[in-house]
């Protein structure tokens, strides 16, 4: 957020940028949480996403029997490892081809025992509030498909007729990690020292990180004719003075007519 400054006062402004704002020759460049000519105001809403996509990672182990293990397979830059990776990836792409959330596989380690393949299956889905269910379902389908292929594609008479063959008993799912998206946590973090006063409210299933100074939400503070301003002690109403009235009170709802006050003073004189 930026505010431009013109004229002689600009040099003075430069040294007065607040809250970590920096002077760029024309204006104070404010950090995300602040705005105003001197970055003196706290924003009332923070963009917290959501992210476009959510990812999941499944740690799996399968045993490939159609390749004999050699020491070169331990070296990820070797010709042998690179070729194994290519064939294994192609085979897994076929296995998981019906899963829209499937992104690919990443081999983490190859070890002896025919060839024991420790790898991650990577999943991704567009963010919706139901993303956990979508990814949970996808992980179940991954389990079903890998179990099926490692049961069906097996060596017969010490020969494999498929692209790869497996040991039926060597298939294990070690761990499943879903990227957590927690709007409340994100909101609190991004609001920094004002975190206690920012909350998440939803509109059309989209989360908004707002302070009570943001109008139009259930937590919004009504300052009437005043201005809502955030401070470290929370949101406060700054009341205005018009030509005819002074306003006061916590929500600037108490108006005092100037003429009455002046009239009262005159009466005493």
């Amino acid at each position: 957020r930026t505010t431009t400054c013109f004229g002689d006062g600009c040099q003075n402004t430069a040294s007065r940028c607040k809250n970590g704002g920096t002077w760029d020759g024309l204006k104070c460049q404010c950090p995300n949480l602040y705005y105003g000519e001197l970055c003196e105001e706290v924003v009332s809403s923070i963009d917290i996403g959501p992210p476009e996509t959510i990812s999941a990672q499944m740690e799996l182990t399968v045993t490939v029997t159609s390749v004999k293990f050699t020491e070169e397979l331990k070296n990820h830059s070797s010709q042998e490892f690179q070729e194994f990776k290519q064939t294994f990836t192609e085979q897994m792409n076929i296995v998981y081809s019906g899963i829209p959330e499937y992104v690919g596989v990443n081999i983490t380690k190859l070890r002896l025992g025919s060839v024991v393949v420790e790898h991650d299956v990577l999943l991704r889905t567009k963010y919706t509030p139901e993303y956990k269910t979508v990814l949970d379902n996808a992980t179940e389908v991954v389990k079903e498909k890998i179990t099926k292929v490692t049961t069906q594609q097996i060596m017969i008479n010490d020969i494999c007729s498929d692209m790869m063959c497996f040991n039926t008993t060597g298939t294990q799912v070690q761990n499943i990690t879903v990227t957590q998206y927690d709007p409340e946590e994100d909101c609190r973090k991004m609001a920094k020292e004002y975190g206690d006063y920012f909350v998440v409210e939803y509109r059309d299933q989209k989360p908004y990180c707002i302070s009570p100074c943001e109008p139009g939400f259930s937590v919004s503070k009504n300052c009437n004719l005043g201005k809502c301003q955030m401070s470290l002690s929370g949101p406060q109403c700054l009341c205005v003075t018009t030509e005819t009235h002074w306003y006061s009170g916590e929500t600037c709802n108490q108006g005092t007519q100037k003429s009455l006050v002046y009239g009262h003073h005159h009466h005493h004189h």
Epitope: K68, S78, Q79, Q86, T87, M155, I159, C160, M164
Partner: nanobody, 124 residues
Framework: DVQLVESGGGVVQPGGSLRLSCAAS????????MAWFRQAPGKEREVVAF????????YYADSVKGRFTISHDNSKNTLYLQMNSLRAEDTAMYYC?????????????????WGQGTQVTVSS
């Protein structure tokens, strides 16, 4: 990258013999797999035989057992297929295939490197 060049194909009478060769280059190790596949017109590519260059394993398709012999010369990095007692049904394009892995599969999709092929025709 691995390169394979076949030679030795030709026309031969039933009962005759041919020797196919396949020169390999580009390997970083002296232990890998090489194979002969063949493909007759209108049919799928099928394995004929494979060998591990460390001598650890050879395999023959049932249809060629006792008639064909696969071998490898490590000093020349060359694969051979000695074909005896040839039959009309052996007529096909013969391909050399290779892998830097010690493969135990006869599925062509598992073999990443291929030559251009050499034609073998058995006809009287």
């Amino acid at each position: 990258d691995v390169q394979l060049v076949e030679s030795g194909g030709g026309v031969v009478q039933p009962g005759g013999s041919l020797r196919l060769s396949c020169a390999a280059s580009g390997y970083t190790s002296n232990r890998y797999s090489m194979a002969w596949f063949r493909q007759a017109p209108g049919k799928e590519r099928e394995v004929v035989a494979f060998i591990w260059t460390d001598g650890g394993r050879t395999y023959y398709a049932d249809s060629v057992k006792g008639r064909f012999t696969i071998s490898h010369d490590n000093s020349k990095n060359t694969l051979y297929l000695q074909m005896n007692s040839l039959r009309a049904e052996d007529t096909a394009m013969y391909y050399c295939a290779a892998s830097s892995l010690l493969l135990q599969t006869i599925n062509p999709r598992a073999w990443p490197y291929w030559g251009q092929g050499t034609q073998v025709t058995v006809s009287s």
